[in-house]
Amino acid sequence: APVPPGEDSKDVAAPHRQPLTSSERIDKQIRYILDGISALRKETCNKSNMCESSKEALAENNLNLPKMAEKDGCFQSGFNEETCLVKIITGLLEFEVYLEYLQNRFESSEEQARAVQMSTKVLIQFLQKKAKNLDAITTPDPTTNASLLTKLQAQNQWLQDMTTHLILRSFKEFLQSSLRALRQM
């Protein structure tokens, strides 16, 4: 697994560099997670032909994966810093159960899957420090998450491959939209 942000050799070799600001740390953390997703997608795409499937075909699924919408205030039209930040944190909290599902789905990238999961938890903590309106953030119900996890794990092999691919793609898209919005804040 790649070394977490802040622990690479460049950082060690440059001890007099200015410490990262909160925004820079968040930016670096998201890029680190995107690198992890990229590695996981490589293994998934090598194992199955899901990656060749059209977006339209893949959209026909009953997974309730978080997605950015106009009303969330993260796009240029209707951009709203506070609303957007709440959506990003809420969405990441909702993704956690899906990241848990990914944990036993990889053979050669098992460590990488764990790194993505743990880095996301750290990212949530960074963002919660940045948010002013923490009351607006709804945490998913643990019981609902547990039954969802059981249901996903009970799927046949083909559906599990499809689910893995969809989670990775949706999580990547969510992080990309989140980071683009955060770069405006």
Epitope: R31, L34, F75, Q76, K172, E173, Q176, S177, L179, R180, R183, Q184
Partner: nanobody
Amino acid sequence: EVQLVESGGGWVQPGGSLKLSCTTSGRRFSEYAVGWFRQAPGKEREFVADIGEQAENTWYAHSVLGRFTISRDDAKNTVYLQMDSLKPEDTAVYYCAADKYGVGGNAQGYYDSWGQGTQVTVSS
């Protein structure tokens, strides 16, 4: 890194239109975000617009909002900047830049590959 080539620049009268293209032969270009920046003589390079890996995620500088449109055709490995209602103050060298994370942003540091630029001149 990807090699980027801009084209479509030229001279146009105020109120006219131009369509810039940013092309690469890189085969995973669809996964990159692409930004357009411009630099007028004696001025800093400034952000114009960008488009994410997800084509619906577009952002514009306030000075071009409603006049410029960024789009992408991944089958042709090309990103376009349609510039309408051009003004003399739009005169600059226009550069395209790519971000391998598919995110983009309004600062030059977010991009890892740059083109050589194409000149746009708006005057009567």
